[in-house]
Every structure is written in C-alpha cells, then in structure tokens.
C-alpha cells in the first residue's frame, strides 16, 4: 500500500512539476524590467524566452518574437534548449509512469516490469527537474551579469552625443515558477525511484524441498532470504514505514495587471 | 462623447493656492491615467504631471514638485490638481488631458481653465 | 530629462505645397521591446486646445487626414503635411513620450502665404 502511496504522490508530484516547466517555458516575464534607480519610463519591459513584450500604462501590451534563430545569444539558446530537453524527458516520463502505476492494470504485466518502468520514470523525472533548474539557473546567472554590466553603463557615461536609455532587467515571475517545477519535479523523480525499490521482486526464492524422514513424511519451505532494508516485498504480516514527505508549492505571485506608468 | 471640463482657475497672489478641478464623462474614468498640460500665454505647452489610474503611479515636471499635488476620485469621474506656493511662473492656461489606450499618447484634451499667478 | 527640439520654429508654404517639419530628441525615443518609438505629434489652431495627430511617431490617430504622416527613429522624426490645406494653419509640437518627466518641443508654427 505505502508503496503504491509513494509511487502514486510521485506521479502527481511530477506531473504539477512538468506542468509547471512547461508553464515556465512559454511565460514571458523570465526578466522584468528594474524599476528601482532607473530612469522612469512610461512603459513597463519584460521578456521571456521567446518573445520580449511591453506594457504601457493604459495596459495596452504588446510583444514582439524573436524572429531570429542565429542572431540571438548563445546562452539564450541554451537556455531554451535546457528548458525543451526537460519538458520531452518529463513528458515521456509521465508516459512510462502512467504504465508503471501500481494501481493501473495492463493485461499480465509482471511487478519487474513495473519496477523497471518506475525506475526509468524516475531517472527521466530527475534529469527532467536538473534540466529546468539548471536552465533557470543560466538565466537568472545571465540577468545578474547584465544587470552589474548596465548598472556599470549607467554610472560611468554613455559615450557620443546621443543617449540611450539603458534598461536594466531583473528576476521575472517565470524563474521562481521554473526553480519551484524543477524542484517537484526532482522531488517526484526521486519519489518514483523509492517506489521502485519498493516494487522490485524478491530476491530468487529457494525452491521447496522435501525431506522425507523415516516414519513419516514433513514438507520443509522455507520463506526465502529477504533483505531487512524495510523495501522488500510488502507481505500481509509486514509494514513498511511511509515517510510521506510533502511538498508546498508557493506560489511566486505576479500582479496580473501593473500599474506602472 | 468624451468630455472634460477644468474649473478652479482664477487670480491667485504669489505665494497662494488654488484648487483646479477636471469633471470627465463619455468613457471609464477610472481606467484610464491622466495628466494636467499648461501652456503660458504665448507660449508653448508644458506638462506639469501625472497620474496612473490606480493612482500607484504619480509624476511631476521638475518646476512644479514640491508644490502641486495631483489627485483623482475615480468614484465622482474627477481630476484635482493642488497647487500651492504659486509664483508668477505659474501663470498659465491648465489643460486636463487623458492618457490614451495606444502609445502613452494624450488623446483628449478639455479646453482648459486660465490660471493667474499676480499681485 | 529629455530635451526635444523642433525646428523650424515657423514656416509659411503655399496651398497644396508638401512641408515637412523635424522634431530631435536628446536621447533615444526607440524601445526595443515592441520596436515602437514613443514620440506624439499634436496640433493647436488658435484658441483651441492642442488636437492628437500621431503616436508611435508613425501611427495616425482615427479621424486624422492621411495627408499627416509621420517617420523617424531612435532620435530624429518628421511630420509630413502632404498638400497643405487653409485648416492646417496651426502650431505643431512633438513630445517624447518615453521617460517621465515628458517633454514637448517648442512647436512649429504653419501659415500659409
């Protein structure tokens, strides 16, 4: 039962984990535009990995695609590449798990195919988790170098006759939900591998033997080895102990509407 | 039909105050910023501030912060400009002006209310 | 704060001549977000209050004559009158509407000779 509790919390877990990557993947606020000591535009910038958008104060929003594949940062492109891997590997993930589910019966499929099945669901759903946050991470690093860089710019002189208005840009919404659905998402990688062991088969059990002693006949079976790891096979007299970690998913809020000017 | 209407102006000695006034009507007041333009006699226009419609947001010229102080009353679809410490300076057709949907531009103006800033 | 400047101060053409006037900003009016410049021209006939013309500096507010029309980027924008018209005779003034506090111009007056 703890088993399939842990297996199932895992599946779950994974599945708001991905949701969220995805969600991440396609919001646009990955960098918003710094307010603080900056000059006061009448417009509010923010940007995401595939498009950069602006608010004006009537709400009026408009965004524009990068509609170019060669002429954008290497890192960006990364990023974007981190972000798609973890979203495809998150995605079949949840396909291979939807099969392993203790719960779910699919015709005489063997517990060693579950567990393997749990195990590669597991192992997708981290890497998954590491790919996301490790693409947020890439990002919120680039935001941090650019904004020290524009701060720099702004304090030592622009240089020629005309200025430009030197944005800088700061964490957006879609970080926090991208580190928060990476991290689930590794925590339900983690979950379904536990589970894993929990439905691994037992070890090669020894076959019965009869001895036949003089004068009348006992049948001798023995039980079979079983390690006292707490993760064997979960017999009706045996029970395993379910931690039952849960996870909070705070939520990063983002007014939905700035009233910037 | 988008109207506004300034009142509030008058003669005022250097040093006084004065309360201008914009009654809006013919669109939702309260989702729309807006902003007080003046233009001395003869001379071109200045705008004087700002103000978002959530009233988050408030900005002023230079010349006049410190001194003015713009409000809204989004629940009587009114504008309010107080001015305080008025110097000759000051003297000036006001303008109440809407904030447009489309590029920050001011696409309504109302035809403005003389302000007169002398001993 | 942004200073804008227009030139020529006044300018006085014949009926259906092509003027253009010139607005230069201080700095940059261009944002690269949405590739829009936030530069507004207006028009103020005489004892009337100022009338939008144009935002984006290129857009053309409804119910404007399609002989306005505006151009430019980053710093310097042109207002075009394409057939001067007796109605045009006015005050134009430009404004940057991309850092507060916002600024216009010193207006370019049109008569008509």
């Known amino acids: 039962m703890a088993v399939t509790a842990c297996q199932g919390l895992g599946f779950v877990v994974s599945l708001i984990g991905i949701a969220g990557i995805i969600a991440a993947t396609c919001m646009d606020q990955w960098s918003t535009q710094d307010l603080y000591n900056n000059p006061v535009t009448a417009v509010f910038n923010y940007q995401g990995l595939w498009r950069s958008c602006v608010r004006e104060s009537s709400g009026f929003t408009e965004c524009r695609g990068y509609f170019t594949l060669l002429g954008l940062p290497a890192m960006l492109q990364a990023v974007r590449a981190l972000m798609i891997v973890g979203i495809v590997l998150g995605a079949i993930g949840l396909l291979v798990s939807i099969f392993a589910l203790k719960c779910i019966r699919i015709g005489s499929m063997e517990d060693s195919a579950k567990a393997n099945m749990t195990l590669t669901s597991g192992i997708m759903f981290i890497v998954s988790g590491l790919c996301a946050i490790a693409g947020v991470s890439v990002f919120a690093n680039m935001l941090v170098t650019n904004f020290w860089m524009s701060t720099a710019n702004m304090y030592t002189g622009m240089g020629g006759m005309v200025q430009t208005v030197q944005t800088r840009y700061t964490f957006g919404a879609a970080l926090f939900v991208g580190w928060v659905a990476g991290g689930l998402t590794l925590i339900g990688g983690v979950m379904m591998c536990i589970a894993c062991r929990g439905l691994a088969p037992e070890e090669t059990n020894y076959k019965a033997v009869s001895y036949h002693a003089s004068g009348h006949s006992v049948a001798y079976k023995p039980g079979g080895f079983k390690a006292s790891t707490g993760f064997g096979s979960n017999t009706k007299n045996k029970k395993i102990y379910d931690g039952g970690a849960r996870t909070e998913d705070e939520v990063q809020s983002y007014p939905s509407k700035h009233d910037y000017v | 039909e988008v109207q506004l209407v300034e009142s509030g102006g008058g003669l005022v000695q250097p040093g006084g105050s004065l309360r201008l006034s914009c009654a809006v009507s013919?669109?939702?007041?309260?989702?729309?910023?807006m902003h007080w333009v003046r233009q001395a006699p003869g001379k071109g226009l200045e705008w004087v501030a700002y103000i978002s419609s959530g009233t988050t947001n408030i900005y002023y010229a230079d010349s006049v912060k410190g001194r003015f102080t713009v409000s809204r009353d989004n629940a009587k679809n009114s504008l309010y400009l107080q001015m305080n410490s008025l110097r000759a300076e000051d003297t000036a057709v006001y303008y109440c002006v809407r904030s447009g949907y489309y590029g920050q531009s001011l696409d309504y103006w109302g035809q403005g209310t003389l302000v007169t800033v002398s001993s | 704060d942004i200073v804008m400047t227009q030139s020529p101060d006044s300018l006085a053409v014949s009926l259906g001549e092509r003027v253009t006037m010139n607005c230069k900003s201080s700095?940059?009016?261009?944002?690269?977000?949405?590739?829009?410049?936030?530069l507004t021209w207006y028009q103020q006939k005489p004892g009337q209050p100022p009338k939008l013309l144009i935002y984006?500096?290129?857009t053309r507010e409804s119910g404007v004559p399609d002989r306005f029309s505006g151009s430019g980027s980053g710093t310097d924008f042109t207002l075009t009158i394409s057939s001067v018209q007796a109605e045009d005779v006015a005050v134009y003034y430009c404004?940057?509407?991309?850092?507060?506090?916002?600024?216009f111009g010193q207006g370019t007056k049109l008569e008509i000779k």
């Open positions: 700095q940059s009016l261009f944002q690269s977000g949405n590739q829009r410049n936030y």
């Open positions: 404004q940057n509407v991309y850092i507060y506090p916002l600024t």
């Open positions: 984006w500096a290129s």
């Open positions: 013919g669109f939702t007041f309260s989702s729309f910023g």
